[in-house]
Structures are given as structure tokens and as C-alpha cells.
């Protein structure tokens, strides 16, 4: 067969698998006169042979690991043995088979990892080699952890990168490793060739001993700092330390205080920079951060707690310039007159704010001094001596000293002696008769005026009248306001009347004084009055069970899906017909009878969520009264919007000619919802040919960098197509255009000759 196994002398390449015993010839070279024989030279290794007639073959199995390419030369000789053709190169490429097992470079590895190290950050590499061809599966290695000792609660603390052999902590390892509990671990690591995918792969194992070292990057104990310190500032209050030297420390004030009185130096010592005031702020929480020389955080921030310790730097304060109390002239000894409550801004429930009360002066001292007592700690004033006589002394003034352990303050109390409360309020009418009202009478309406009188001293607590409804209004639909000058009571509607639940109410009022009655005097029937409230029916509108109905559906629900329902009842028991109002997008329909709401068109969260419509409930028959409620449809996002550029990028330019490859940054967005982590876009060029000139590299989930691959661009506009994939479910891809102009520049801006001013790029790179 000419061509495949035989032919004239010419350069040729043959591929032969290693490890296979010879089963056929390699090639039959044909001699052209005057050539009659052939000879073979080069890297034959006594394996490759050519017979005089030109039959090239090999006599035993090849080994790629000994030699992967045999460079041979074949020459054609004439009858005298003179080379008349060639020599030509004949290349034998030895193809790999999996005849070598991987072996670890070390039978035992040792490493250490600090507790709380970042998960996924390698702290040790294991390395194996395999003599087979790494470009084939035979030489592709796959690393695995076979066992971790000890294994606590079946949780793996360590992980290995299958391809690189990098060992790092898992999330659990980062959180739970503790040298105090377990200072060392042992891993058995296996390596397989064939990428770990084949049953026929070879393997090797190694042992890894790991020491867990303490992480000294720990939050210090909470600090207590005494307020108003007079020591020279700054004052060191605590410290943090990164595990290795060279960290850059900073403090972060999460509260964004107008003044932040703390600092940190490059040793990690934390200082308070000025005196603190507990009454301004009694505690601070801030964070200490350690970064590397590139400003990248080395670990999580530490929370620093500073409690400001109280000193007694605030005097007691009086509740008002003068505190006024009343006392009846016949009150008994020991009766409470009232309580003086002073304040102290120092820390509550400490000696600094614990107050003592003492009467330092009584005026007038008639009929004697010491008529009043004050409870030392409670501040309650009591009558200490005989009953008082209003006609002798209608008013007393007390000066009271209020003190904490260091400060004293004087407060003033005025005690008015009032007539004894020996008269009860008496209603001018015991029965105010019947009152008929429609159930839709407005809230706030005064429906009745009542009047009682009290013969005690006017404008004192003994004669002031408070009216209470004690019977017939358990729903609290009515209330009584009192005019303090006339003691007239105005009965008002506080809540809607309701014929359906209370058509007739028998109301009873009681008139009382705020001051207690003297011993032996009691309220009697004169202090009570009644009236009957008759509520008449009004045809009322239906009542919805809720002011706002809410439902939640995915924005991609099929047309005709039930998305919610509303319910209303008619107070008179009539049937109800439901309808929608304000369905501006035409998305919904409502079942007139049941109140069920269905979609009738595709929904779109990005058009606005929640979608708000009004539902109307109308009586069927009767006067067709209706009422309105809200229906809010919350649309849950599905990934139905492809990514796009976050803004208009016209006007990007590079100055031509480029002196070095340049780059520009662009941002993508999409209209779908991105909870918690934000978008996670991936970026690629719009077609393969663009990859000759451009490269796009991801910066983060929303930003990418477009770079030139060379400097050989023409002076014109290039439109670079970029594919942005949102990685959603399902993934959506947007193809966007970035127009980039290469133009001659004057002082860093695109130069356009006069008359060519259209579309001037404005952003130079």
C-alpha cells in the first residue's frame, strides 16, 4: 500500500506507543536508481533497524521515559555504498502509556497552621511526580485527603486542592481548630494519576503532620476607663497583636461618632486620646484591623469594648423650680402628701446617684416647726404633726436639701392646705333619658352634656369632678371630657357605634374627686346617673377583613395563576361583588364572587414591586354601597434580565500611537434582584477574533478591565463586543459594545481638526 506503509525517501514522523512489542513494520522505503540499499543512523538505541532493502522496523518495546523522541537518519546508497539520497530525518515520537506510578517527593511532610487562619489559604503543599507524560491523563495527578486524625464529630478541618496539592483549612477548621484542645493533626494524603478518574490509575500516599499554633489575634478583654481623667493623654488602655511582625494597624469606628477619642500605634497599642464623659456616652465599641503592606486585611477585625466608669461629677437636680402639693386640713398624721423626685445624671443604682432628702426649712413655722416629714431615701412627704387649719395658714413652703455623696442641691416645695373633702359630687339629674343616634354618627361628636356639683373648696382636688362610665360600654365607644372650670361633662363618641352588635346601651356614669373623701363619708346614689343610648341601623358598606391584603408570587408565574384573594363581609348580610380598581398594567382579574385574584398577563418585577391595586367590595342589591381595600402583590425575582453596562461609555479613548498597552475599567449591572452578595458577573470578549487585540479580566462581581494586548492599533474607533454572563438560574448573557477610539491627542485630549467635532470622546485612558 503506497503512502501509508511504503514510499520514497523523505522526512517522516511516526508515532509509536511505548511498552508494546513490535507487531508490524514501521515503513518500507523504496529505492530510486542508482540507489540500491539503505542505512540507518542516529538515536537507534539498538532498537530501530533498517534492512538493506529499506524495511524500517523496531525489535523491542520502546520506553518513553528513557527517550521520548528518537531522531534517526535514513540514507540511500548506491551499489558502491556511496550516499546518493539523504540522509533524511526520520522522527519517532514515543507515545505515552501509564506505566509509571506517581510518587510523593517526601514520605512525610510537616507544617503548621495558625488557628482561625483564613479558610482556603494554603499553608503547606505536598508534591508528587509521575514520569509519564503530563500532557496526557497518565501524568495528570489528583490529590486527596484519605483520613484526618483526629476526626471530631466527623468534621473535616483540612482540605486539599486536587490539582496543586495545596493544603488549607476548611471553614469549620478555621472556626474550630484550637491548640488548647488539639495541638496536632495527622493527614494521610493520596495521589493518583489518570486525573484520579480511572480504576486503573496508580497511586501513592504520604503522611502530613500539622501543628496548630495559637492565634494571638484575639479581642482583648473589655476595658474600663474612668471618665474625666486628668492624667496626661493619650493613655494606653489595651493592645492587640498580629501573629507576625510588620502588620499595619488601624481602628474602625462603626458608630461614626462626631469625635472618636481612640487611636492605635504601629505596635498595636490602643490609646484613649482625650478625657471621656460617661454622661455623654457610657460605652464604646469599635474595631481593630490588621493589614499587610498592600493594605489587604490579614484577618477579621477585632471588637474592642470600652466601658466608661462613672465618677460623681453631677449634682442632684430638682424636678421643677417649685413642686406643688395639696393637703386637706383634716388629714391624719402620716398621710402621704406627695413625692419629690429629684434626678442625678450619674450612673443609676450607684452611690454617685443615690439621693438623700432632708427638710432644711419650713415657712411659716406656724403653729409650729416640723409639721412635715420627708422619707430620707424615697422623698415622700408626710404629715408629721397635728391637722392643719386653712384659715390659720393656707400655704407652707419647704426647702428640701437633696444630696448625693458629694453634692447638695436645694429644692422648693409649696404645700397648699385645702378644705376637707367632706362633700360628694351630686348629679343634677339621675337619668338623662333616651338618646337615639344613627350608627354612622361621627367619631368626636358630643352627644350629651352632664353636670354634677361639689360643695367643697373650688379649684381644689376636693371639688374637682372626674366622670367615669362604669356600666353599659364595655367596648369603650364613649368617653367623657370634663371642663375644669365648670365641672361640666361632655359625652363624646370615641369609637364607631354599631347597630349590629349594640342596638341599645344602658350607660351609668359615676362622678368622683381626685382627693380622697374624709373618713366616714362615702359616694352614694347622688354621684351616679344613667342614660339609654339607642343606635339606629344605617345601611353600611361592606367591611374588608384587612386594610391591606398582601400576596407573594414569582414574577414568571403562568398566566391564569391564582395570586391571592380578598374577603369582605356586609354588616347587613348582603352578598358582595368584588372588582379591581387601578390595575394600570392590566395584569390581574378578580373573581367577582369569591374574591380570588388571578394573573391575566406576564408579570414583571422590574416594572415595580410590590404591584399595588385597589379591590372594591360592593353590596349586591340594596343601595350598592362599596368599600375599598389595598391589594399588594409582591413579585419575587427570577433571572430574566441580561446584564448590561451600568452607564454610557461613549467617549472612551486612547492617545494614538499607544506607547504601552493600556486599559480601562467598566461596570455592569442588571435589573434583577441581587440579595446579600450582589451581582456575580463573568466577563468575556464577544468573539474569538477580539482576543488577538484585547483582553477582558474580571475585577469583582460588577467591574472588569478591558486591556489592549499590544500597541499596534490604527487611528480610528474600535467597537469591542463584550459578553457579560450573570451566572443566574438560568444564566443570562448580555452582549454589550464598548466603543474605544484611538486618536491623536493634544494635552491629553482627543484632537479633532475644525469641522470634525462630532462625537468627541471625553474619557482619556
Amino acid at each position: 500500500q503506497e503512502g501509508k506503509f511504503s514510499g520514497p525517501l523523505k522526512p517522516m514522523t511516526f508515532s509509536i506507543y511505548e511498552g508494546q512489542e513490535p507487531s508490524q513494520i514501521i515503513f518500507q522505503f523504496k529505492a530510486n536508481p542508482p540507489a540500491v540499499t539503505f542505512e540507518l543512523t542516529g538515536e537507534t538505541d539498538n532498537i530501530f533497524v533498517i534492512e538493506r532493502e529499506g524495511l524500517l522496523y523496531y525489535n523491542r518495546a520502546l520506553d518513553r521515559e528513557t527517550r521520548s523522541t528518537h531522531n534517526l537518519q535514513v540514507a540511500a546508497l548506491d551499489a558502491n555504498g556511496i550516499i546518493v539520497e539523504g540522509p533524511v530525518p526520520i522522527t519517532i515520537k514515543v507515545k505515552d502509556i501509564n506505566d509509571n506510578r506517581p510518587t510523593f517527593l517526601q514520605s512525610k511532610y510537616e507544617g503548621s497552621v495558625r488557628q482561625n487562619s483564613r479558610p482556603g489559604k494554603p499553608f503547606l503543599y505536598v508534591n508528587a511526580t509521575d514520569l509519564d507524560d503530563p500532557a496526557t491523563p497518565n501524568g495528570q495527578l489528583y490529590y486527596q485527603i484519605v483520613i484526618q486524625l483526629p476526626m471530631i464529630n466527623n468534621v473535616m478541618y483540612f482540605q486539599i486542592n486536587n490539582k496543586t496539592g495545596a493544603i488549607s483549612l476548611t471553614r469549620e477548621g478555621s472556626q474550630e481548630l484550637n491548640p488548647a484542645k488539639n495541638p496536632s493533626y495527622n493527614l494521610v494524603i493520596s495521589v493518583k494519576d489518570m486525573g484520579g478518574q480511572s480504576e486503573n490509575s496508580f497511586s501513592d500516599t504520604t503522611s502530613v503532620d500539622i501543628i496548630v499554633t495559637e492565634n494571638i489575634w484575639k479581642a482583648p478583654k473589655p476595658v474600663e476607663m474612668v471618665e474625666n481623667s486628668t492624667d496626661p493623654h493619650p493613655i494606653k488602655i489595651t493592645q492587640v497583636r498580629w501573629n507576625d511582625p510588620g502588620a499595619q494597624y488601624s481602628l474602625v469606628d462603626k458608630e461614626k461618632l462626631p469625635r472618636f477619642p481612640f487611636s492605635i500605634d504601629q505596635e498595636g497599642d490602643i490609646y484613649v486620646t482625650q478625657p471621656l464623659d460617661r454622661e455623654e456616652k457610657d460605652a464604646y465599641v469599635f474595631y481593630a484591623v490588621a493589614k499587610d503592606e498592600y493594605g489587604k486585611p490579614l484577618s477579621y477585625p477585632l471588637e474592642i469594648h470600652v466601658k466608661v466608669k462613672d465618677i460623681n461629677d453631677n449634682p442632684p437636680t430638682c424636678p421643677s423650680p417649685v413642686t406643688v402639693f395639696e393637703v386637706q386640713e383634716n388629714e391624719r398624721l402620716g398621710n402621704s402628701i406627695g413625692t419629690l423626685t429629684a434626678h442625678d445624671r450619674d450612673e443609676e443604682n450607684t452611690a454617685n446617684s443615690f439621693l438623700n432628702y432632708r427638710i432644711v426649712e419650713q415657712t411659716p413655722k406656724l403653729p409650729m416647726d416640723g409639721l412635715f416629714l420627708i422619707q430620707t431615701y424615697a422623698g415622700m412627704l408626710q404629715l408629721a404633726k397635728q391637722s392643719l387649719k386653712k384659715q390659720d395658714t393656707p400655704q407652707y413652703n419647704l426647702t428640701i436639701e437633696v444630696s448625693d455623696k458629694d453634692f447638695k442641691t436645694l429644692c422648693f416645695v409649696q404645700i397648699n392646705v385645702i378644705d376637707i373633702n367632706d362633700q360628694i359630687p351630686i348629679f343634677e339629674k339621675s337619668d338623662y333619658g333616651n338618646l337615639t343616634l344613627a350608627e354612622d354618627t361621627n367619631i368626636g361628636s358630643t352627644i350629651l352634656t352632664i353636670q354634677a356639683t361639689d360643695a367643697d373648696e373650688p379649684f381644689t382636688g376636693s371639688s374637682k369632678i372626674l366622670y367615669h362610665i362604669i356600666k353599659g360600654d364595655s367596648e369603650g365607644r364613649l368617653g367623657v371630657d370634663t371642663d375644669p372650670h365648670t365641672n361640666t361633662g361632655y359625652v363624646i363618641i370615641k369609637k364607631p357605634l354599631d347597630f349590629e352588635t349594640a342596638a341599645v346601651s344602658n350607660i351609668v356614669f359615676k362622678a368622683e374627686n381626685p382627693e380622697p373623701l374624709v373618713f366616714g363619708v362615702k359616694y352614694n346614689a347622688s354621684s351616679f346617673a344613667k342614660f339609654t343610648l339607642i343606635v339606629t341601623d344605617v345601611n353600611e358598606a361592606p367591611q374588608f377583613s384587612q386594610h391591606v391584603f398582601q400576596a407573594k408570587v414569582s414574577e414568571d408565574v403562568a398566566i391564569g395563576t391564582k395570586v391571592g384573594n380578598v374577603t369582605a363581609k356586609d354588616p347587613e348580610g348582603l352578598d358582595i361583588s368584588y372588582s379591581l380598581r387601578g390595575d394600570t398594567r392590566g395584569w390581574l382579574k378578580i373573581d367577582h364572587v369569591t374574591g380570588e385574584i388571578f394573573s391575566v398577563a406576564p408579570l414583571d418585577r422590574e416594572a415595580g414591586s410590590p404591584y399595588r391595586v385597589q379591590v372594591v367590595a360592593t353590596e349586591v342589591g340594596g343601595s350598592s354601597l362599596s368599600s375599598v381595600s389595598e391589594f399588594h402583590l409582591i413579585l419575587m425575582d427570577v433571572n430574566d434580565n441580561p446584564p448590561r453596562l451600568a452607564k454610557d461609555y461613549t467617549g472612551l479613548f486612547f492617545c494614538h500611537p499607544l506607547s504601552a498597552p493600556g486599559s480601562l475599567i467598566f461596570e455592569a449591572t442588571d435589573d434583577d434582584q441581587h440579595l446579600f452578595r450582589g451581582p456575580h458577573f463573568t466577563f468575556s470578549l464577544g468573539s474569538g477574533s477580539l482576543q488577538n487585540d484585547w483582553e477582558v479580566s474580571k475585577i469583582n462581581g460588577t467591574h472588569a478591565r478591558l486591556s489592549t494586548r499590544h500597541t499596534e492599533f490604527e487611528e480610528r474607533e474600535y467597537v469591542v463586543l463584550i459578553r457579560i454572563n450573570d451566572g443566574g438560574r438560568p444564566p443570562l448573557e448580555g452582549i454589550v459594545s464598548l466603543p474605544v477610539t484611538f486618536c491623536s491627542c493634544v494635552e491629553g485630549s482627543c484632537f479633532r481638526p475644525a469641522g470634525h467635532q462630532t462625537g468627541i470622546p471625553t474619557v482619556g485612558m
Epitope: 463573568t682 466577563f683 468575556s684 470578549l685 468573539s687 474569538g688 477574533s689 477580539l690 482576543q691 488577538n692 487585540d693 477582558v696 494586548r709 499590544h710 499596534e712 492599533f713 490604527e714 480610528r716 459578553r723 454572563n725 444564566p731 448573557e733
Partner: antibody
Framework: QVQLQQSGAELMKPGASVKLSCKAT????????IEWIKQRPGHGLEWIGE????????NYNEKFKGKATFTADTSSNTAYMELSSLTTEDSAIYYC???????WGQGTTLTVSS | DIQMTQSPSSLSASLGERVSLTCRAS??????VNWLQQEPDGTIKRLIY???SLESGVPKRFSGSRSGSDYFLTISSLESEDFVDYYC?????????FGAGTKLELK
Amino acid sequence: QVQLQQSGAELMKPGASVKLSCKATGYTFTGYWIEWIKQRPGHGLEWIGEILPGSGSTNYNEKFKGKATFTADTSSNTAYMELSSLTTEDSAIYYCARAGYNNWGQGTTLTVSS
Amino acid sequence: DIQMTQSPSSLSASLGERVSLTCRASQDIGRSVNWLQQEPDGTIKRLIYATSSLESGVPKRFSGSRSGSDYFLTISSLESEDFVDYYCLQYASSPLTFGAGTKLELK
């Protein structure tokens, strides 16, 4: 370093289909287009089309639409080209290349013969 | 489709000689041209991209240039390993098209 390893030679009968593979290593497979090129003696090199593995997006030369179908498996970093309804005209060496053409596979020889 | 007319189809030259290969484009393709080298075993590598940018690792004796719609690959001083096949490729518009190739032979 970047490498593209193509599957071995194929001998197929007319009318059959064949799936050629191209395994990529040494770079982020999902972010670069993979190009497929045909080489036949006397016909030089012909661009068949390309696939972006990250999204499965494809561009085909009109001439090869219906003949070639591209797919990619990002878990194994492998691109595939399936050629259907094979004829002797499809006998050729097929190359895959990373877009930009700075990295090429070693080629797969396809022979279609009855 | 854009045609890339490559000449000569074969070229005999001596070691140390300077040679130029040409590709002519049927339409304006700007600087969107690559030059490829194919060895006898089929191995292909890129020598020049974007008309004149030299691929890293490629000897400096290779250079690319352009005059109008003509694109040139120049080898300033031939060495033994340079006697292989060369192709130009345009990537300005789809479908991408190649020149028919130049076989460089040792004289």
C-alpha cells in the same frame, strides 16, 4: 503553561458522526474562545467556528453550519466538535486553538473511508 | 468573505538569506493579521500578531509589516529550522480566513 491536548486519530465510515475533543490546561478555560480549524492538503487552512466555554455561545462559518456542532464541558475543561454525516471531503487534520491563535492543539487526523 | 492571497506558494532560499512573504487582503482589514508557522509534524505556532507584534519567545529575526493592503512576514537571516510552512490569517471579519501558505525550502 497553556496546553491544548486533542484526541487521537479517527478512521470513520461515510455517513457516521465523530466527536473530537480538545482538553485545555494552564488557563481559565471559561473565559477564552476555542477556535476549530480544518486543514486539507491542497485546501490550506479553513476556519470552522468557535465556542465560548463559559456560556456555550458559538459562532460558525456559514460553510460548516449543519456539519459541525461545538460543545464544552467546563468541569473537565474540554471542548468538543462533532462532525455529522461524514463524507470523504471531511478527511482532514482538525486543530483546536485558543482564540488569538497563540496556542494550538497538536491536531486530530480524521480519515473517512468506506 | 475576505480573500487572503499569499505569495509565493513556495520559496527556495539559502541559510542566512533575507526573505519576505506577502499576503494581500481583498478588503480593508486594518492591522488584524497574524502570521503562523507550521512544522512538518503539524505543530502550529503564532509568530506575529496584529500585523507587527512579535509573539514572546519568537526570535527577533522574524518581523511583520504592512503597506496598504499588503502584509509582509520578513525573516532577516534564515536558519535551518525556518524551512517550514507559513500562513497568514485575517481576523478583522467573520469568517476568519487564511492565506494558502508558503513552503520555505532550503536551496
